[in-house]
Amino acid sequence: PEPPTACREKQYLINSQCCSLCQPGQKLVSDCTEFTETECLPCGESEFLDTWNRETHCHQHKYCDPNLGLRVQQKGTSETDTICTCEEGWHCTSEACESCVLHRSCSPGFGVKQIATGVSDTICEPCPVGFFSNVSSAFEKCHPWTSCETKDLVVQQAGTNKTDVVCGPQDRLRA
């Protein structure tokens, strides 16, 4: 018969013959021959291969370096890599999450629109008219100005995006 030029799924072509690929979690030890099957061995501890493959070495699991603010989100298996995320208060600098930076704080005059997660930074927004923030915070939203009227008081000092209004007693007109 004619030697094959292409092989079935989960096979590979070597020296005009089709050999079985190794399943995920296993590495290639030796190619098949006309008499013997492909031989594969499981990846070792802290190693993985996530596809049908003919790799002779497994990949090392990612190391979540605590010195870079990383921690393990999901432990790797023989078929999957370790997934890292950042410690509380930090977020990844990239999708691969190779290092972390502190969550950004929203300056006075800005409030938190969206609190940071392990993978996304804090999203800030300017405090609109009627709202203020007088602190630098990664959690605080803009607060509404105090309503002097509901306290039967009057505005003595107007609020800004960084300060609350100052309320005071109403001036009584004397007869």
Epitope: N15, Q17, V29, D31, C32, T36, E37
Partner: nanobody, 117 residues
Framework: EVQLLESGGGLVQPGGSLRLSCAAS????????MGWARQAPGKGLEWVSA????????YYADSVKGRFTISRDNSKNTLYLQMNSLRAEDTAVYYC??????????WGQGTLVTVSS
């Protein structure tokens, strides 16, 4: 340099047993499939048996099934062929072979097995 050195051949009576050895050197023995082939006087090369790198996969020619056993000791870089219930038609020069990239590419010098009464 790859070297394959067969030993254990000799004269044996029909029904007898022999154990052939193949000492390998010059390559990482436990990374390659190995095999035995034979050539009887005036005949072509016949594959007898083969074994995967870790011994997980074996092959036997129909003519030797149930009588011959292939094995390997990767710690000693040695391939074996245990031959029982030998017959006159097993008389041949037996060659040890190493596979690479799916083909048997290195051969030993051979050891002669003679089965005769």
């Amino acid at each position: 340099e790859v070297q394959l050195l067969e030993s254990g051949g000799g004269l044996v009576q029909p029904g007898g047993s022999l154990r052939l050895s193949c000492a390998a050197s010059g390559f990482t023995f436990d990374s390659y499939a190995m095999g035995w082939a034979r050539q009887a006087p005036g005949k072509g090369l016949e594959w007898v048996s083969a074994i995967g790198a870790k011994g997980l996969s074996t092959y036997y020619a129909d003519s030797v099934k149930g009588r011959f056993t292939i094995s390997r000791d990767n710690s000693k870089n040695t391939l074996y062929l245990q031959m029982n219930s030998l017959r006159a038609e097993d008389t041949a020069v037996y060659y040890c072979a190493k596979a690479a990239r799916g083909k048997f590419d290195y051969w030993g010098q051979g050891t002669l097995v003679t089965v005769s009464s």
